[in-house]
């Protein structure tokens, strides 16, 4: 058993039929010694008396909010949550496996630049009785500070008959140098509590590997005289690290016809302009990627040819 | 990267072209190592991230763009004790900090070159003949060092009499390639920045 936060405790249980469970001793936080009684979840049934209560925790029925009282007055609470371990593996019932980039990916993170700021998100099909808390650090043995905000519900989607809820959190490394070469990964730890069930999820990454620039901005077309060609120009996204001559991007320019089956013309360039043939009803899209470290491409920025 | 990218103009800052070749060569070598050593811990997640230049050179600090010198997090340990000559410096651009930066890059290359050559000698003794260092990568390191043209004592190649542990050598190769790729990215950024200055 360990303390998650004040008055909230997690009991780790091997989960199998007829498992013996864990013996837990609860102590009433009071100087009083006599006349103390214990109840569970504000039920009026008295479970025991005395300053300590010993319980055998085997299943969810044994978890909950234990309260000690004296003469009708509440003295203290202890909330017991369960963390299930089945066949040596901690349960992952609360979050959905996103399966990208690999199986058992519950947390996904992205950074728009090298400032040390990043966003992580996760999915669940649970809509109520759910709380998350997020901690992060650089390295684990001698951790350096990363500050995370509160996790918030960022999107709701319907997937077939099911509703899916996306939560996200923003974190910032306390003292990040954009030019630094990372040797210790960022660790992100998410505590998830659904009713009386506790689970934890972790992700470990280097900022350089989760970079995904915002799409190029101010995408413009300039027709060239007496030609079907146009000059496409764009700018670095505002959120990208500066100076741009140090944190350079490379770009992919794509001409896509109205039909998805039509052949796509693609050009790669390090410049912020390109000359392409603009077909009728086609659109021109540009996306960006770190020029030197091939992490993710940005989403496309697009303009119609006409 | 396996994308078509325009090559730089010949009149450009002479080291930029070499640094781009270096990044391409080390990235290819790392990809090859990951594929060939698929049953070894060779991915970024699996290896320990070691920097053989740690406490010996300070390329990131010495080559920090001017714009980032205001960022306190970037100014932990700025070194100021490097050699100050080199042929990559166009005379107008010669400055103490830039010389310091380029000499730090040169020292990095020299250290990695020694490590890679020593390692290659061991890998050549492996009866499985599973993996060797790409000669192109070693050549590209050499070319960039020549372009930088700093006067520096040659470091003798480490020789070892005992039978090498090939498993350990291959893991060390992965660690080294990962670290060198990260340093090659920094070098490329620096050259691009200096070229634009």
């Amino acid at each position: 058993i360990w303390e998650l936060k004040k008055d909230v405790y997690v009991v780790e249980l091997d989960w199998y039929p007829d498992a013996p469970g864990e013996m837990v001793v609860l102590t009433c936080d009071t100087p009083e010694e006599d006349g103390i009684t214990w109840t569970l979840d504000q039920s009026s049934e008295v479970l025991g008396s005395g300053k300590t209560l010993t319980i055998q925790v085997k299943e969810f029925g044994d978890a909950g909010q234990y309260t000690c009282h004296k003469g009708g007055e509440v003295l203290s609470h202890s909330l017991l949550l369960l963390h299930k371990k089945e066949d040596g593996i901690w349960s992952t019932d609360i979050l959905k496996d996103q399966k990208e980039p690999k199986n058992k990916t519950f947390l996904r993170c992205e950074a728009k630049n090298y400032s040390g700021r990043f966003t992580c998100w996760w999915l669940t099909t649970i809509s109520t009785d759910l709380t998350f808390s997020v901690k992060s650090s650089r390295g684990s043995s001698d951790p350096q500070g990363v500050t995370c905000g509160a996790a918030t519900l960022s999107a709701e989607r319907v997937r077939g008959d099911n509703k899916e809820y996306e939560y996200s959190v923003e974190c910032q490394e306390d003292s990040a140098c954009p030019a630094a070469e990372e040797s210790l990964p960022i660790e992100v730890m998410v505590d998830a509590v659904h009713k009386l069930k506790y689970e934890n999820y972790t992700s470990s990454f280097f900022i350089r590997d989760i970079i995904k620039p915002d799409p190029p901005k101010n995408l413009q077309l300039k027709p060239l005289k007496n030609s079907r060609q146009v000059e496409v120009s764009w700018e670095y996204p505002d959120t990208w690290s500066t100076p741009h001559s140090y944190f350079s991007l490379t770009f992919c320019v794509q001409v896509q016809g109205k039909s998805k089956r039509e052949k796509k013309d693609r050009v790669f360039t390090d410049k912020t302009s390109a000359t392409v043939i603009c077909r009728k009803n086609a659109s021109i899209s540009v996306r960006a990627q770190d020029r030197y470290y091939s992490s993710s491409w940005s989403e496309w920025a697009s303009v119609p040819c006409s | 990267r396996n994308l078509p990218v325009a090559t730089p103009d010949p009149g450009m800052f002479p080291c930029l072209h070499h640094s781009q070749n270096l990044l391409r060569a080390v990235s290819n070598m790392l990809q090859k190592a990951r594929q060939t050593l698929e049953f070894y811990p060779c991915t970024s997640e699996e290896i320990d991230h070691e920097d053989i230049t740690k406490d010996k050179t300070s390329t990131v600090e010495a080559c920090l763009p001017l714009e980032l010198t205001k960022n306190e997090s970037c100014l932990n340990s700025r070194e100021t004790s490097f050699i100050t000559n080199g042929s990559c410096l166009a005379s107008r651009k010669t400055s103490f900090m830039m010389a310091l930066c380029l000499s730090s890059i040169y020292e990095d290359l020299k250290m990695y070159q020694v490590e890679f050559k020593t390692m290659n000698a061991k890998l050549l003794m492996d009866p499985k003949r599973q993996i060797f260092l790409d000669q192109n990568m070693l050549a590209v390191i050499d070319e960039l060092m020549q372009a930088l043209n700093f006067n520096s004592e040659t470091v003798p190649q480490k020789s070892s009499l005992e039978e090498p542990d090939f498993y350990k050598t291959k893991i060390k190769l992965c660690i080294l390639l990962h670290a060198f790729r990260i340093r090659a990215v920094t070098i490329d950024r620096v050259m691009s920045y200096l070229n634009a200055s």
């Epitope: 979840d41 504000q42 969810f60 909950g64 009713k195 009386l196 | -």
Partner: antibody, heavy 119, light 107 residues
Amino acid sequence: EVTLRESGPALVKPTQTLTLTCTFSGFSLSKSVMGVSWIRQPPGKALEWLAHIYWDDDKYYNPSLKSRLTISKDTSKNQVVLTMTNMDPVDTATYYCTRRGIRSAMDYWGQGTTVTVSS
Amino acid sequence: DVVMTQSPDSLAVSLGERATINCKASQSVSNDVAWYQQKPGQPPKLLIYYASNRYTGVPDRFSGSGYGTDFTLTISSLQAEDVAVYYCQQDYNSPWTFGGGTKVEIK
């Protein structure tokens, strides 16, 4: 001992607003992991959950009725109030308020109040 | 919404015999299912929570099982006082939903 009691009009006219009050004792909605739900049951039919309010004022509504429902609490009076606008004869039912404990089942129920919607 | 489908609609069992009621969720609801007993003219009473945990004071002839989408309430030896309508309910996801009910009678 935990008790809940529903109160409100027995008869409302169509289009009118129904206001129901749940007065409870034996537990508090101020600082514990508790909540109060409203559930209704049309004559001879199944139960339908309407709305829920948690101790921290977090509120949930049944989406099919969300635009017509408002749930609120007065912790000092140990009361939870449900209002339902634009009543219709199909809303005729027994309305229950229930306590929902941390183990997330409705462990205590009021006796229910029967509401008839008719002109 | 998660649809809870109860079967059978009604069930006649001899005194002392076993009664089994099934509840199927339209999607996985983990173990977040409760069972209630409602007698005529009374509010429902909680019997089982978290699919298999008997509520305080509920006789041990009542048991629940299941996980994910399939859940069962079993009365191992039916007594006269068990005549009632039984409802399953999920609160894994909002809106919390009830089954249509199963009427248990004595044969």
